[in-house]
């Protein structure tokens, strides 16, 4: 987790006086609790928005945007906690919007935004709003969270972000597996214009079950400049197994800006539909 | 421009099953996570089920989980509800909502403002 360009946060707005500052996700009024506290945000919305860094790349961004409630505990309102954690990491980053002048009411509804977070592709992450100073022990929560999931490198937009591109996401393999005889598949695939090596990685399943009854991997050596943007075909020798006839296959690239981390592309080729076999009807018909 | 419209309501009885549909046009579709929100007669809004551009996420409120499913076609620019063993207190007015950006929130949009409603279809459950 991380800020795009650290740079240039601002959160000042016509009659607030506002800095954005880093946190320790730890306010001060946890521990020094005080009497008097603001009321919850006000619908929290979270978009995702693209943004360009100086160099000129392209990262997802979280967009968050709340509203203030109109009550009189906006007087005592010194700022802001934004939270932000990724769920399968348990990573957090917070940075804090401190209020330098006092809020007052005017004719329209408070609205805050910060876009600086960045998120990775087909990550979720609770985004926590939190009013300043935090609420005393059992006092109302002034706090507003939502859950939100990032769409992955297979999504048109994202395909076209910097961290997609880097693990591959351009590359189109339009991989195609046909059944030969003899037990084998012929795969092909197209290759990209990268002179790096690729794994086939074949599993196999018995129909309707998802243990594999056969695995192999087979090592594509890197093309030469010539052969990019062309048909790989690579023939599989099938294990002889009766009922194992579900096939996946998995191509694993290695290219320079993921390595092993690269996203991997599959086709699965199902079971050929057993014919109902009606019962044979005999030629003649028995007297008892 | 951009519409919703839900169709597939109806009067029905406790136990029986209903599947609504909602058609999408005016925008980029598979771009968009989607839900289902409903709001009883004289209550407030309360969402049902979510599904991401791919249907690779879906989630359902409590109330709903194990009756309900949700699905959608890409190619036909169509989100469907599945509703199984349906009570009575599923009578409603069912709308169909998309979300404002490309991202997904669990436990409804991810903005309190929803960017575009169809008209609703009105599920009534009675005996």
């Known amino acids: 987790l991380r800020l795009l360009d650290h740079r240039a946060l601002v959160c000042s707005q016509p009659g607030l006086n506002c800095t954005v500052k880093n946190s320790t996700c730890l306010d001060d009024s946890w521990i020094h609790p005080r009497n008097l506290t603001p009321s919850s945000p006000k619908d929290l919305q979270i978009q995702l928005h693209f943004a360009h860094t100086q160099q000129g790349d392209l990262f997802p961004v979280a967009h968050i945007e709340w509203t203030l409630q109109t009550d009189a505990s906006i007087l005592y309102l010194e700022g802001a906690e934004l939270s932000v954690l990724q769920l399968n990491t348990n990573e957090r980053l917070c940075v804090r919007f401190e209020f330098l002048s006092k809020l007052r009411h005017h004719h329209r509804r408070w609205r805050f935004t910060f876009s600086h977070f960045v998120v990775d592709p087909d990550q979720e992450y609770e985004v926590t709003v939190h009013h300043l100073p935090k609420p005393i022990p059992d006092g109302d929560p002034n706090h507003q969270s939502k859950n939100f999931l990032v769409p992955d490198c297979e999504h048109a937009r994202m395909k076209v972000t910097t961290p997609c591109m880097s693990s591959g996401s351009l590359w189109d393999p339009n991989i195609t597996v046909e059944t030969l005889e003899a037990h084998q598949l012929r795969v092909s695939f197209t290759l990209w214009n990268e002179s790096t090596h690729y794994q086939i990685l074949l599993t196999s399943f018995p129909h309707m079950e998802n243990h594999s009854c056969f695995e192999h991997m087979h090592h594509i050596p890197a093309p030469r400049p010539e052969e990019f943007h062309q048909r790989s075909n690579v023939t599989l020798t099938l294990r002889n197994l009766k009922g194992c006839c579900r096939h996946q296959v998995q191509i694993q690239p290695f290219f320079s800006s993921c390595l092993n981390d690269c996203l991997r592309h599959s086709a699965t080729v199902s079971c050929p539909e057993m014919p109902d076999t009606p019962e044979p009807i005999p030629d003649y018909m028995p007297l008892w | 421009q951009v519409q919703l419209v839900e169709s597939g309501g109806g009067l029905v009885q406790p136990g029986r099953s209903l599947r609504l549909s909602c058609a999408a046009s005016?925008?980029?579709?598979?771009?968009?996570?989607m839900h289902w929100v409903r709001q009883a007669p004289g209550k407030g809004l309360e969402w049902v089920s979510g599904?991401?551009?791919?249907?690779?996420?879906?989630d359902y409120a409590d109330s709903v989980k194990g009756r309900f499913t949700i699905s959608r076609d890409n190619a036909k620019n169509s989100l469907y509800l599945q509703m199984n063993s349906l009570r009575t207190e599923d009578t409603a007015l069912y709308y169909c909502?998309?979300?404002?950006?490309?991202?997904?929130?669990?436990?409804?949009?991810?903005?309190?403002?929803?960017?575009?409603w169809g008209q609703g279809t009105m599920v009534t459950v009675s005996s």
């Open positions: 005016g925008f980029t579709f598979d771009d968009y996570a």
């Open positions: 599904i991401t551009w791919n249907s690779g996420r879906i």
């Open positions: 909502v998309k979300e404002r950006s490309l991202g997904y929130c669990r436990g409804g949009p991810c903005s309190d403002a929803f960017d575009i």
